[in-house]
């Protein structure tokens, strides 16, 4: 449970005490330069006006400098993600300065109190950066603030208060409560750095949204829609975070943003790509897999700088663990006739066969309804790289898997007992790969047989025109 300040006194006292007594008080914010990958090493504590620690710990004035900022905590001890992030940064950027911003005394409070302390911590970071700017060769452009949860808003304050503009702020699931809908100067926002990129992994439209739902950066990435993260179990946690304990489920989803960022550092050969889209539903429909006009980007550390006139919301699917990368496909299925469909939406599955591997059986999620005499678009994704696609198996599930569909079938039977077989006709499937941006058209193996009905399958092979590029740009980006 949160502890009081104890002998160090309250923050308000520290801010208003006369200078003579301020020197007797331990700082509530400490800057630990992690000079070694070894967690046992004590590092170097930096303080404004004291140059010796910079020399003792070989602070590299021309290198990139990362400030890692934790969030609210119910513990007096760092959470485990911090070590993983520091280690990953050291691995990826060997010459960089990695500074841990330790504000545990101010974060280990009731949530509301910790929120009220974020501004002070932001000021403290800004003062440190202003002092470092006085040194030869140090450039704010090389500074990258990485803030998790409440720490993301601390980074925003720091970027707002510093003299000049920091190079980049990454917000890792910025905190939602008390920040949702807040004025731009009271939360992380695009004007806090030259480039602000954000990962949202625990947003909720019902109950309590621990992560902020609104876009707050130049690019705002919503993995898996920004809410239910694969591998995180039950998702019905609604308890208050100011007084209650955060369950493992909440921790898993909220912290997923950190692990996605770590993944981008250590698995740079397996980058995950996100695609611009107006909302999660349209993305689920498979409509938004374009890379034209900066509409796609790498996520995490490898994100390409984009300074849009307005916030850019981007989406992607991920695996349940590292490496998180999946391969996205848009499937356009033209249904040209429709027979005895009744009320029930069909349940379709596809299996993709490629030169490298074959996919598992993948469900086609029907976001609204199947339209006849129209092109229906779906999103499917695979965990493995299939290579070039060769053929597709489309299956219409037979027996209903849901009670709702069984009830609808029963109702349909009562009203029309001799309902002839349901059927629809599909001649071709157009597929676009999100990762390669290549497009391919698949035709039915037997041009005479284009009908599919419950419990049946239809096979499609690459039509003769093969892959078509259509001037789309690949999402491959230059790594920083």
């Amino acid at each position: 449970s949160p502890v009081p300040f104890g002998p160090e006194g309250r923050l308000e006292d520290k801010l208003h005490k006369p200078k003579a007594t301020q020197t007797e008080v331990k700082p509530s914010v400490r800057f630990n330069l992690r000079t070694s990958k070894d967690p046992e090493h004590e590092g170097c504590y930096l303080s404004v006006g004291h140059s010796q620690p910079l020399e003792d710990c070989s602070f590299n004035m021309t290198a990139k400098t990362f400030f890692i900022i934790h969030g609210w905590t119910m513990s007096g001890i760092f959470e485990n993600w911090l070590h993983k992030l520091v280690s990953a940064l050291h691995t990826r950027e060997k010459d960089a300065n990695v500074v841990v911003v330790d504000w545990l005394p101010l974060a280990h409070q009731l949530y509301t109190d910790a929120v009220n302390n974020t501004r002070v911590v932001g000021h403290s970071i800004a003062r440190m950066l202003d002092w470092l700017q006085e040194k030869d060769d140090f450039s704010l452009g090389n500074v990258h603030l990485i803030g998790y949860s409440l720490g993301a808003h601390v980074a925003g304050y720091a970027g707002n208060f510093v003299k000049g503009t920091v190079g980049r702020i990454t917000g890792l699931d910025p905190a939602g409560p008390m920040f949702e809908g807040a004025d731009i100067h009271k939360r992380l926002s695009p004007d806090d750095a030259d480039f602000v990129d954000v990962l949202h992994t625990y947003t909720r439209s019902f109950g309590l949204s621990i992560g902020i739902q609104m876009p707050v950066g130049h690019i705002d990435i919503y993995p898996n829609g920004g809410d239910f993260q694969p591998g995180c179990g039950l998702n019905d946690v609604l308890g208050s975070i100011a007084y209650g304990t955060i369950t493992e489920v909440v921790k898993c989803e909220h912290e997923r943003a950190v692990h996605l960022f770590v993944d981008s550092l250590v698995n740079q050969d397996k980058p995950s790509f996100a695609f611009q889209c107006t909302d999660s539903n349209r993305f689920k429909k498979g409509i938004c897999l374009s890379c034209r006009k900066n509409r796609c980007n790498s996520i995490g550390y490898n994100a390409k700088k984009m300074r849009n006139k307005r916030n850019s919301k981007m989406y992607l699917k991920t695996r349940a663990g590292m490496p998180f990368r999946v391969y996205h496909y848009q499937m356009k299925i033209h249904v040209f006739s429709y027979k005895n469909m009744g009320e029930i939406e069909p349940t379709f599955y596809v299996t993709l066969y490629g030169t490298n591997a074959d996919s598992q059986t993948l469900p086609l999620e029907i976001v609204e309804r199947i339209e006849q005499n129209a092109t229906n678009t779906f999103l499917v994704y695979t965990e493995e790289d299939l290579g070039d696609l060769l053929k597709i198996q489309l299956t219409w599930e037979g027996a209903s898997q849901s009670w709702y569909n069984l009830w609808k079938e029963f109702r349909s039977y009562l009203s029309q007992p001799r309902n002839p077989g349901r059927e629809l006709n599909i001649r071709r499937i157009r597929v676009k790969s999100g990762e390669t941006q290549r497009k391919l058209t698949f035709c039915t193996e037997d041009p005479e047989n284009t009908s599919i009905s419950p419990g049946r399958e239809l096979w499609f092979r690459k039509c003769r025109d093969g892959w078509r590029m259509k001037n789309e740009t690949s999402p491959t980006v230059e790594l920083p």
């Epitope: 331990k26 967690p39 007096g76 485990n80």
Partner: antibody
């Protein structure tokens, strides 16, 4: 060199409390977390909780939360673990252990304090 | 809480031979796994931290591997002083938990 020296063995009656001390030397006491781990005879090691000596913030194992209190005296570079409402199953060797910077692994341990609870 | 399970409970190996000890976590703990050696009447001693990082002063014959839920401690060539009880510990989430131990005995 880093040293953690614990107080001596204790014999207590059920329902009583015990307070074990751990004096640290050879490093800056406030730079590393201090944890308490116990081991009952023939049992696995059991993490009880830890303290951030810099400001006194604590984390406890829920199993002991209502009975354990971890404190520190920075001027004496000493951490304390008090366990109340003792029962016979609390008979164990109690260790203090210094965490790494992140508090995850324990490279330095005290010699252990045997606490016997018997009526 | 995360449950750590070690196997085997007892391992009998001859001096000079290789010993392989296993530790399994009930859920993914990434690399937040540490190995300790404990001899009777002594405090545990850290051998390997964060799954594979070596500790200064610990002989090079001790090595660790694994990630996620499966971890291994390998002692390449057993010396007489290596016969002891070995524990794994996770620090991925609170409460930190230890395995029940593997007793390494002389064959």
């Amino acid at each position: 060199q880093v040293q953690l020296v614990q107080s001596g063995a204790e014999v207590k009656k059920p329902g009583a409390s015990v307070k074990v001390s751990c004096k640290a030397s050879g490093y800056t006491f406030t730079d590393y977390t201090m944890h308490w781990v116990r081991q009952a005879p023939g049992q696995r090691l059991e993490w009880m909780g830890g303290i951030n000596p810099y400001y006194g913030g604590t984390t406890y194992n829920e199993k002991f939360k209502d009975r354990v209190t971890i404190t520190r005296d920075t001027s004496a570079s000493t951490a304390y673990m008090e366990l109340s409402s003792l029962r016979s199953e609390d008979t164990a060797v109690y260790y203090c252990a210094r965490g790494d910077y992140y508090g995850g692994s324990y490279n330095y341990w005290g010699q252990g304090t045997t606490v016997t609870v018997s009526s | 809480e995360i449950v750590m399970t070690q196997s085997p409970a007892t391992l009998s190996v001859s001096p000079g031979e290789r010993a392989t000890l296993s530790c399994r976590a009930s859920q993914d703990i990434s690399n937040s796994l540490h190995w300790y050696q404990q001899k009777p009447g002594q405090a545990p001693r850290l051998l390997i931290k964060y799954a594979s990082q070596s500790i200064s002063g610990i002989p090079a014959r001790f090595s660790g591997s694994g990630s996620g839920t499966e971890f291994t401690l390998t002692i390449s060539s057993l010396q007489s002083e290596d016969f002891a009880v070995y524990y794994c510990q996770q620090s991925n989430s609170w409460p930190y938990t230890f395995g029940q131990g593997t007793k390494l005995e002389i064959k």
